[in-house]
Interface confidence: medium
C-alpha cells in the first residue's frame, strides 16, 4: 500500500491509473466504501463522504487513462485508506495529514518558550525535527518547547515530520519581540547633551503599549522613575516626566530620548522597560551613561568620570602629543603643577578611546579656559 | 510561499536532448501536480505534459508523445522535462508550473532553450 | 483537442477605463456534474512567466486585485478590467483544463491609449 503525507489546509493528489489509455469508470471511496467520486461517462460524479465539497478529479487527464483524486482544505480526520476501483482492480492509498502549530501566539518575548504542537492522525508515530534560523536543531514526538528565545530565533523554523519513510515539511514563521541591543552605553563630557536610542529589532503593523525609564544614579541610594510613556499604533506619547533631569522623547519609533544637559549628578544606569498590549511580560533594554569632567583648581588639574565603568578601562591625563603623564585604572586621576598647554583627559578601553575631553592650561599669572 | 526553481538557460544542437530541472521549495511536493509549458519567442502558451510526483502518473499532450519525458525526484523535491530529437521550432523558454486541479497558480522563473546548429 | 480563441488580438484602453478581452472554446467546457466551467485566465508581462488571475471562468485567485473579473459558460468567455491601470499593461490568455490537452487562447495584447 502506498503512503501518502499531507499537510493540513494543504491539498493533495492521489493518483490512480488504468492500463488503458481511455476514459473508463473509475470510483475513489474511502476504508468504509463510501464512495467519493466517480465518473458516469464525462460527468463527474460524487458520493456521499464528507469530503464531498472538498473532493475533485482532474478530467482532463481520464482521456489518458489517469483518475486521480484531490482533496483541498486537508484536515487531520481525512487521514484514511483512498481507494481507486479501476478496471476490476483496486488501488489502495493511505494517506496520513499532519499539522504543526505554535501553541501560543508566534509573536513572542526575548526569554519566552516557544512550544511547537504536531497534529497527527491516530495510529501514526511520526519524529519532528526542527531547525531554528540560527541552526539549532530540536527534536521530539507530539510536541517540541524551546526555552529562553533568543532574538536570532526570530525568522523562519523549518520542520520536517517522518512517517513511514516519508517527509512532510513545515515553516512557522517565528518573532521574538526584543530590543535591538539588550545593553547600551553612552560617554558624555559634562554640559553635552544626550541622545539615547532604543531600537526594536521587530516590526509590526501596529503596536500599542506603555513603557518606563528607571534610572539608579550612581550618586543617589534609590532608583527614579524619569519618564513614562504611552505607545499607540507606533505613536509615542509621554504621560510623565521628572523636572530634573527633563528629558524629552521623539513621537516616533524607535523610542528616543534626549538629556539636555550630561552632569554628573545624572551618571549611572537606567532599565528602559516596555509592555506590549496583549503580551504578559515586558522587553527590556539597559542603557548606561558616563560623564567626564576635566577641571583645573589652583595647581591641580583634575579629569573625573562618574557612571558604571569597567575596572579595565584607563583614564589619562596627558599634554597634546606628548606621553601621559598619568595613566589609571580608577575613575578620577589628577597633575599638579601642570605645565601650560592643552591637556587631554582620555578614558579609553585596550588603546581605543571612549571619551576625551580637552582643557587648556594657561601659565601660572593666567586663569584656566575651557574649550 | 511556494517556489519553483528552474535550472540555466541551455543551447543545444539540432537532434540532441535537453533536460530542464524544477526544484520546489516551501510546500508539500509530492501532494501536487507539475505541469511544463513552453513558449516560443513572441508566441503563446503550449503545455507539454503533466506529473504526479507521488505517483510518479505522467500525461504527454500528443504532439510531444515519444519525444518528452517528465520525471520526478521527491527526495529533492524536483521535477524534469527532458525533450530529444531537438530541432530549431523547439527554441523557447520552458516553464514548469504547480497544476491545480489544471490550472496553474505557481510558475518557476523559466529556463531559455535555444536550438542552433 | 479543444481550440482556444481570442478576441481582439490587440487593444489599447486610456487609464481608469474598462478593457474587455473574449475568450471562445471549439467545445463546452462546462460539466454538468459540478456546474463548473474549466477556464481559467493569466496576466503575463515581458519577461516574467504568466501569472493566473481567474479560475473556475469567475473565481479571483487571492490577491488578485478586484478590478479583475472573470464571466461566462460553456463556451463564451470574458475577462474584465474594471479601471485599467498602467502595471495591467501585459498580454491575457485564457485556459481550458476541461479536456487533455489542455490548451491557451493566443493571447491578447493590452496596452494603454
Known amino acids: 500500500k502506498k503512503v501518502v503525507l499531507g499537510k493540513k489546509g494543504d491539498t493533495v493528489e492521489l493518483t490512480c491509473t488504468a492500463s488503458q489509455k481511455k476514459s473508463i469508470q473509475f470510483h475513489w471511496k474511502n476504508s468504509n466504501q463510501i464512495k467519493i467520486l466517480g465518473n458516469q461517462g464525462s460527468f463527474l460524479t460524487k458520493g456521499p463522504s464528507k469530503l464531498n465539497d472538498r473532493a475533485d478529479s482532474r478530467r482532463s487527464l481520464w482521456d489518458q487513462g489517469n483518475f486521480p483524486l484531490i482533496i483541498k482544505n486537508l484536515k487531520i480526520e481525512d487521514s484514511d485508506t483512498y481507494i481507486c476501483e479501476v478496471e476490476d482492480q483496486k488501488e489502495e492509498v493511505q494517506l496520513l495529514v499532519f499539522g504543526l502549530t505554535a501553541n501560543s501566539d508566534t509573536h513572542l518575548l526575548q526569554g519566552q518558550s516557544l512550544t511547537l504542537t504536531l497534529e497527527s492522525p491516530p495510529g501514526s508515530s511520526p519524529s519532528v525535527q526542527c531547525r531554528s534560523p540560527r541552526g539549532k536543531n530540536i527534536q521530539g514526538g507530539k510536541t517540541l518547547s524551546v526555552s529562553q528565545l533568543e532574538l536570532q530565533d526570530s525568522g523562519t523554523w523549518t520542520c520536517t515530520v517522518l512517517q513511514n519513510q516519508k517527509k512532510v515539511e513545515f515553516k512557522i514563521d517565528i518573532v521574538v519581540l526584543a530590543f535591538q541591543k539588550a545593553s547600551s552605553i553612552v560617554y558624555k563630557k559634562e554640559g553635552e547633551q544626550v541622545e539615547f536610542s532604543f531600537p526594536l529589532a521587530f516590526t509590526v503593523e501596529k503596536l500599542t503599549g506603555s513603557g518606563e525609564l528607571w534610572w539608579q544614579a550612581e550618586r543617589a541610594s534609590s532608583s527614579k522613575s524619569w519618564i513614562t510613556f504611552d505607545l499607540k499604533n507606533k505613536e509615542v506619547s509621554v504621560k510623565r516626566v521628572t523636572q530634573d533631569p527633563k528629558l524629552q522623547m521623539g513621537k516616533k519609533l524607535p523610542l528616543h530620548l534626549t538629556l539636555p544637559q550630561a552632569l554628573p549628578q545624572y551618571a549611572g544606569s537606567g532599565n528602559l522597560t516596555l509592555a506590549l498590549e496583549a503580551k504578559t511580560g515586558k522587553l527590556h533594554q539597559e542603557v548606561n551613561l558616563v560623564v567626564m569632567r576635566a577641571t583645573q583648581l589652583q595647581k591641580n588639574l583634575t579629569c573625573e568620570v562618574w557612571g558604571p565603568t569597567s575596572p579595565k578601562l584607563m583614564l589619562s591625563l596627558k599634554l597634546e602629543n606628548k606621553e601621559a603623564k598619568v595613566s589609571k585604572r580608577e575613575k578620577a586621576v589628577w597633575v599638579l603643577n601642570p605645565e601650560a598647554g592643552m591637556w587631554q583627559c582620555l578614558l579609553s578601553d585596550s588603546g581605543q578611546v571612549l571619551l576625551e575631553s580637552n582643557i587648556k592650561v594657561l601659565p601660572t599669572w593666567s586663569t584656566p579656559v575651557q574649550p | 510561499q511556494v517556489q519553483l526553481v528552474q535550472s540555466g538557460a541551455e543551447v543545444k544542437k539540432p537532434g540532441s536532448s535537453v533536460k530542464v530541472s524544477c526544484k520546489a521549495s516551501g510546500g508539500t511536493f509530492s501532494n501536487y501536480a507539475i505541469s511544463w509549458v513552453r513558449q516560443a519567442p513572441g508566441q503563446g502558451l503550449e503545455w507539454m505534459g503533466i506529473?504526479?510526483?507521488?505517483?510518479?502518473?505522467?500525461t504527454y499532450a500528443h504532439k510531444f508523445q515519444g519525444r518528452v519525458t517528465i520525471t520526478a525526484d521527491e527526495s529533492t523535491s524536483t521535477a524534469y522535462m527532458e525533450l530529444s530529437s531537438l530541432r530549431s521550432e523547439d527554441t523557447a523558454v520552458y516553464y514548469c508550473?504547480?497544476?491545480?486541479?489544471?490550472?496553474?497558480?505557481?510558475w518557476g522563473q523559466g529556463t531559455l532553450v535555444t536550438v542552433s546548429s | 483537442d479543444i481550440v482556444m480563441t481570442q478576441s481582439p488580438d490587440s487593444l489599447a484602453v486610456s487609464l481608469g477605463e474598462r478593457a474587455t478581452i473574449n475568450c471562445k472554446s471549439s467545445q463546452s467546457v462546462l460539466s454538468s456534474s459540478n456546474n463548473k466551467n474549466y477556464l481559467a485566465w493569466y496576466q503575463q508581462k515581458p519577461g516574467q512567466p504568466p501569472k493566473l488571475l481567474i479560475y473556475w471562468a469567475s473565481t479571483r485567485e487571492s490577491g488578485v486585485p478586484d478590478r479583475f473579473s472573470g464571466s461566462g459558460s460553456g463556451t463564451d468567455f470574458t475577462l474584465t478590467i474594471s479601471s485599467l491601470q498602467a502595471e495591467d499593461v501585459a498580454v491575457y490568455y485564457c485556459?481550458?483544463?476541461?479536456?487533455?490537452?489542455?490548451?491557451f487562447g493566443p493571447g491578447t495584447k493590452v496596452d494603454i491609449k
Open positions: 506529473i504526479t510526483p507521488s505517483g510518479g502518473s505522467t
Open positions: 485556459q481550458q483544463y476541461y479536456g487533455s490537452p489542455l490548451t
Open positions: 508550473a504547480r497544476d491545480t486541479a489544471g490550472h496553474f497558480d505557481i
